[in-house]
């Protein structure tokens, strides 16, 4: 008999696990891209928006060649945990404008949580340490204004989009090295 219903499929092949993580990351990337576009349509953004509490982008074209699986997975998980916290904050603190995006933000949060669970599973299968974030988690303060929360939403979705984009590239490259 196979594993009990609902339990994760046990795989001895890390490449298959990585494939699964890549699929989830791609799916989340598509959702994020769509929601970011929706945000731009509904609440046009003038210029680039940044948020000090967001993680800095871990990967770039220059660093792709030197990537190691443990480092990538650990950093990706830490960064995505930060983005999850920011999405949760947006849903609660965003005001009426962002409440109109509530179904989509809720779905995005659920997908993000699912990807984090998959990464955690992958790390445990590869016997990698479940690293904690380098810095202590600082509570996210209230947006200064409604406009501030819209700017924050643009920054969060934009940053998540970039992070996921590099994550897909990095994971695919690492798969070839396994």
């Amino acid at each position: 008999p196979g594993p009990p219903a609902g339990s994760p499929r046990v795989s001895s092949d890390p490449r298959a696990d990585l494939d699964s993580a890549v699929l989830l990351t791609r799916s989340l990337l598509a959702d994020t891209r769509q929601l970011a576009a929706q945000m731009r349509d509904k609440f046009p953004a003038d210029g680039d928006h940044s948020l000090d509490s967001l993680p800095t982008l871990a990967m770039s074209a220059g660093t792709l060649g030197s990537l190691q699986l443990p480092g990538v997975l650990t950093r990706l998980r830490v960064d995505l945990m930060s983005y999850l916290r920011h999405v949760q904050w947006l849903r609660r603190a965003g005001g009426p404008s962002l409440k109109t995006l509530e179904p989509e933000l809720g779905a995005l949060q659920a997908r993000l949580e699912r990807l984090l669970r998959r990464l955690q599973l992958l790390m445990s299968r590869l016997a990698l340490p479940q690293a904690a974030p380098d810095q202590p988690v600082i509570p996210l303060g209230p947006p200064a204004s409604a406009w501030g929360s819209i700017r924050a939403a643009h920054a969060i979705l934009g940053g998540l989009h970039l992070t996921l984009d590099w994550a897909v590239r990095g994971l695919l490259l690492l798969k070839t090295r396994l």
Epitope: R91, G95, S97, K99, P142, A144, S149
Partner: antibody, heavy 117, light 111 residues
Framework: QVQLVESGGGVVQPGRSLRLSCAAS????????MHWVRQAPGKGLEWVAV????????FYADSVKGRFTISRDNSKNTLYLQMNSLRAEDTAVYYC??????????WGQGTLVTVSS | QSVLTQPPSASGTPGQRVTISCSGS????????VNWYQQLPGTAPKLLIY???LRPSGVPDRFSGSKSGTSASLAISGLRSEDEADYYC???????????FGGGTKLTVLG
């Protein structure tokens, strides 16, 4: 300093209309969502409506839906509440309130609306 | 009837600690921030606690907020006569797409 001043209240007969205004000063009005909250004599607070910073998003309490309209003029730093088909149960002090997100950080002093024949 | 449930009254003597509860559901308190307002007789409400447990500048640290699941509470320690007022809890409600308030709690400072 932040100031919100409501006006336009008064005595009105059932079925008639009234328009309330809320003049805002001391902050960048166009960056904030704005709400109307009311309080019937001797009763608790009741939320009425909200309008987003740009005016594109509006939500209403079920008790006023279809009768009241919230609007704003960012060039005049003014919030409005158009109240039609007024009923006796709409009698209350109406407050405008500013919100940076999920809470009302500043309130006006209120304007009394009395619906009576 | 209010969506959020508060006790209609509470009382205490000067120096005492008083707690006011606010009960809601998963669509309001359970998934959104809780705020508390103080309304002194004949005046407009004033923000007391926001984001579940934060105090605006100028609000004494005798006032504190907390939240667990679908309930929240406001605690006032070192009760003073000037704390006699009506207290309201509030939160956004995702099902109603609007703000909901508790019915209010009238706090009386005895003696």
């Amino acid at each position: 300093q932040v100031q919100l001043v409501e006006s336009g209240g008064g005595v009105v007969q059932p079925g008639r209309s009234l328009r309330l205004s809320c003049a805002a000063s001391g902050f960048t009005f166009s960056h904030y969502d704005m709400h109307w909250v009311r309080q019937a004599p001797g009763k608790g607070l009741e939320w009425v409506a909200v309008i987003s910073y740009s005016g594109s998003v509006k939500f209403y309490a079920d008790s006023v839906k279809g009768r009241f309209t919230i609007s704003r003029d960012n060039s005049k730093n003014t919030l409005y509440l158009q109240m039609n088909s007024l009923r006796a149960e709409d009698t209350a002090v109406y407050y405008c309130a500013r919100t940076p997100g999920s809470h009302f950080d500043y309130w006006g002093q209120g304007t009394l609306v009395t619906v009576s024949s | 009837q209010s969506v959020l449930t508060q006790p209609p009254s509470a009382s205490g003597t000067p120096g005492q600690r008083v707690t006011i509860s606010c009960s809601g559901s998963s669509s309001n308190i359970g998934s959104n921030y809780v705020n508390w307002y103080q309304q002194l007789p004949g005046t407009a409400p004033k923000l007391l606690i926001y984001y579940d447990d934060l105090r605006p500048s100028g609000v004494p640290d005798r006032f504190s907020g907390s939240k667990s699941g679908t309930s929240a509470s406001l605690a006032i320690s070192g009760l003073r006569s000037e704390d006699e007022a009506d207290y309201y809890c509030s939160a956004w409600d995702d099902s109603l797409s609007g703000v909901v308030f508790g019915g209010g709690t009238k706090l009386t400072v005895l003696g």
